[in-house]
Interface confidence: medium
């Protein structure tokens, strides 16, 4: 009764299609698979960025897999062939591992790469990234930004740079069609006549870096003798009402400061007839139903009631 063996996949490699971190892991079938023609051979793939403690594990029948990686670090992967127990009349058979690595040969010392990279997706409409030049780089150093997300045929270079002293220090992106809820990859590389410049790679999802506009049309309405309803409208733009959280700051008679976070465009405030002055401001942020993270908007313009009976007047800014 001969022991059943299976070979590992052939030509296992990590292929960089030029998408700034979105890599293909590819392999060829093992030799001598024809013995198992009636059987679905599977592959167990493990991969990670070098330095990560955990492996991602995938079991697939395909000969390729795609995922995003941090190209600032190396990548390691390993794969083996699996013969399910149905193929072997017994227990699952595994081949030995085939292993591969991939990294981009770094140019320049780490200090030459851009510093303090910051990207904000203003009002879910306009992406702007800014950075500071690397430490100790000369004025002849210029940085170039490239970006890619699934849907683009190839990585694109920024066409509208923000400049300071002749150096690129940021990028205003064009309209980015169908670019949210997927990984957005950026590489900022550089060139200098004096020394090589280290490239930097960044990955994020646009919906997680949205900074909305502040809410507008703040109003007061007296609901009862002891309640005032504060209302406002969602900011103009593409973000639907269901995607907002709000933070309100309310000041009564220059003494009491109320801070509250709410999900709707209203807030009911308990007050007294003695209230002589009421002011509030609101800011907005994309909520957990639409993103994993976000940036608070600027505060709205202040809306105040002063010296008049709130029961007689609704104030509209």
């Amino acid at each position: 009764d001969t022991e059943i063996k299976v070979n590992p996949p052939q030509d296992f490699e990590i292929v960089d299609p030029g998408y700034l971190g979105y890599l293909y892991l590819q392999w060829q079938p093992p030799l001598s698979l024809d013995h198992f023609k009636e059987c679905t051979v599977e592959y167990e793939l493990k991969y990670r960025n070098i330095g990560s403690e955990t492996w991602k594990t995938i079991i697939t029948k395909n000969l390729h897999y795609k995922d995003g990686f941090d190209l600032n670090k190396g990548i390691e992967a390993k794969i083996h062939t699996l013969l399910p127990w149905q193929c072997t009349n017994g227990s699952e058979v595994q081949s030995s591992w085939a292993e591969t690595t991939y990294w981009i040969s770094p140019q320049g010392i780490p200090e030459t790469k851009v510093q303090d990279m910051d990207c904000v997706y203003y009002n879910w409409q306009y992406l702007l990234c800014s950075w500071k030049p690397g430490i100790g780089v000369l004025l002849d150093t210029n940085y170039n930004l490239f970006y890619w997300y699934e849907g683009l045929d190839h990585a694109l270079q920024c066409v509208d740079y923000i400049k300071a002293d002749g150096q690129n220090i940021g990028c205003r992106f064009p309209y980015l069609e169908a670019s949210d809820y997927k990984d957005f990859y950026i590489c900022v590389n550089g060139s200098s006549e004096n020394k090589p410049i280290r490239s930097s790679y960044f990955t994020f999802q646009l919906q997680n870096i949205v900074k909305p506009l502040p809410p507008v049309y703040l109003t007061f309405t007296r609901e009862s003798s002891c309640e005032i309803k504060l209302k406002w409208s969602i900011p103009l733009g593409p973000i639907p009402a269901r995607c907002f959280d709000y933070e309100i700051e309310i000041r009564e008679d220059d003494t009491t400061l109320v801070t509250a976070t709410v999900e709707n465009e209203t807030y009911t405030l308990k007050t007294t007839n003695e209230t002589r002055q009421l002011c509030f401001v609101v800011r907005s942020k994309v909520n957990i139903y639409c993103s994993d993270d976000g940036i608070w908007s600027e505060w709205s313009d202040k809306q105040c009631w002063e010296g008049e009976d709130l029961s007689k007047k609704t104030l509209l800014r």
Epitope: Q10, D11, E13, I14, V15, D16, P17, Y24, Q26, Q28, P29, L31, S32, L33, D34, H35, K37, V41, K61, L63, H64, T100
Partner: antibody, heavy 122, light 107 residues
Framework: EVQLVESGGGLVQPGGSLRLSCAAS????????MSWVRQAPGKGLEWVAT????????YYADSVKGRFTISRDNAKNSLYLQMNSLRAEDTAVYYC???????????????WGQGTLVTVSS | DIQMTQSPSSLSASVGDRVTITCKAS??????VAWYQQKPGKAPKLLIY???YRSTGVPSRFSGSGSGTDFTLTISSLQPEDFATYYC?????????FGGGTKVEIK
């Protein structure tokens, strides 16, 4: 339409060099291994070299090892064959061929270019 | 290296004939054999891979069989456009060698 177009062939003297190119279109080039296969006038097919999809794995026929170099540029959808120290017996039509791949099989050639003629003669 | 020995080297047949071409590998290659058709002045065209799997668009009159060392390409009813040279190739392990070819001519 899936297409492979070879170029770079011509007449070269023995000991000379030539670089063949193959432009691929109509498929995701970086997903397939690629090969060069040649055919001497009036003779059969001879496999020359293969490069894997990412370029990490390269295989040569003994008859060209050390003289020919296969390479690819996935960004340009191009395959190359650098031929040095050419001999009269290298005279052939050189075909660029895509490596077909199925779940159980690989290394057969499912798409071929039209070929480019290399003549090595003094 | 694995050698592929093809026979016959040529044959004459008429339209409608059943034609069989054989290929023998010098060692066991499982089912890793492909068959190609080539017409004068043209590039080869894949017919069969993995011994018996027809490539996309190949007519059903072409079939392949065999495993181990002995393989067969059969054309069940020869058509005028089938007059050409046929090659086998093993796709088991490098180097990937071809048979010497079989020229199918009009009788």
């Amino acid at each position: 339409e899936v297409q492979l177009v070879e170029s770079g062939g011509g007449l070269v003297q023995p000991g000379g060099s030539l670089r063949l190119s193959c432009a691929a279109s109509g498929f995701t080039f970086s997903r397939n291994g690629m090969s060069w296969v040649r055919q001497a006038p009036g003779k059969g097919l001879e496999w020359v070299a293969t490069v894997s999809s990412g370029g990490s794995y390269i295989y040569y026929a003994d008859s060209v090892k050390g003289r020919f170099t296969i390479s690819r540029d996935n960004a340009k959808n191009s395959l190359y064959l650098q031929m040095n120290s050419l001999r009269a017996e290298d005279t052939a039509v050189y075909y660029c061929a895509r490596q077909g791949t199925t779940a159980l099989a690989t290394r057969f050639f499912d798409v071929w270019g039209q070929g480019t003629l290399v003549t090595v003669s003094s | 290296d694995i050698q592929m020995t093809q026979s016959p080297s040529s044959l004459s047949a008429s339209v409608g004939d059943r034609v069989t071409i054989t290929c023998k590998a010098s060692q066991d290659v499982g089912t890793a054999v492909a068959w190609y058709q080539q017409k004068p002045g043209k590039a080869p065209k894949l017919l069969i891979y993995s011994a018996s799997y027809r490539s996309t668009g190949v007519p059903s009159r072409f079939s392949g069989s065999g495993s181990g060392t002995d393989f067969t390409l059969t054309i069940s009813s020869l058509q005028p456009e089938d007059f050409a040279t046929y090659y086998c190739q093993h796709h088991y392990s490098a180097p990937w060698t071809f048979g010497g070819g079989t020229k199918v001519e009009i009788k």
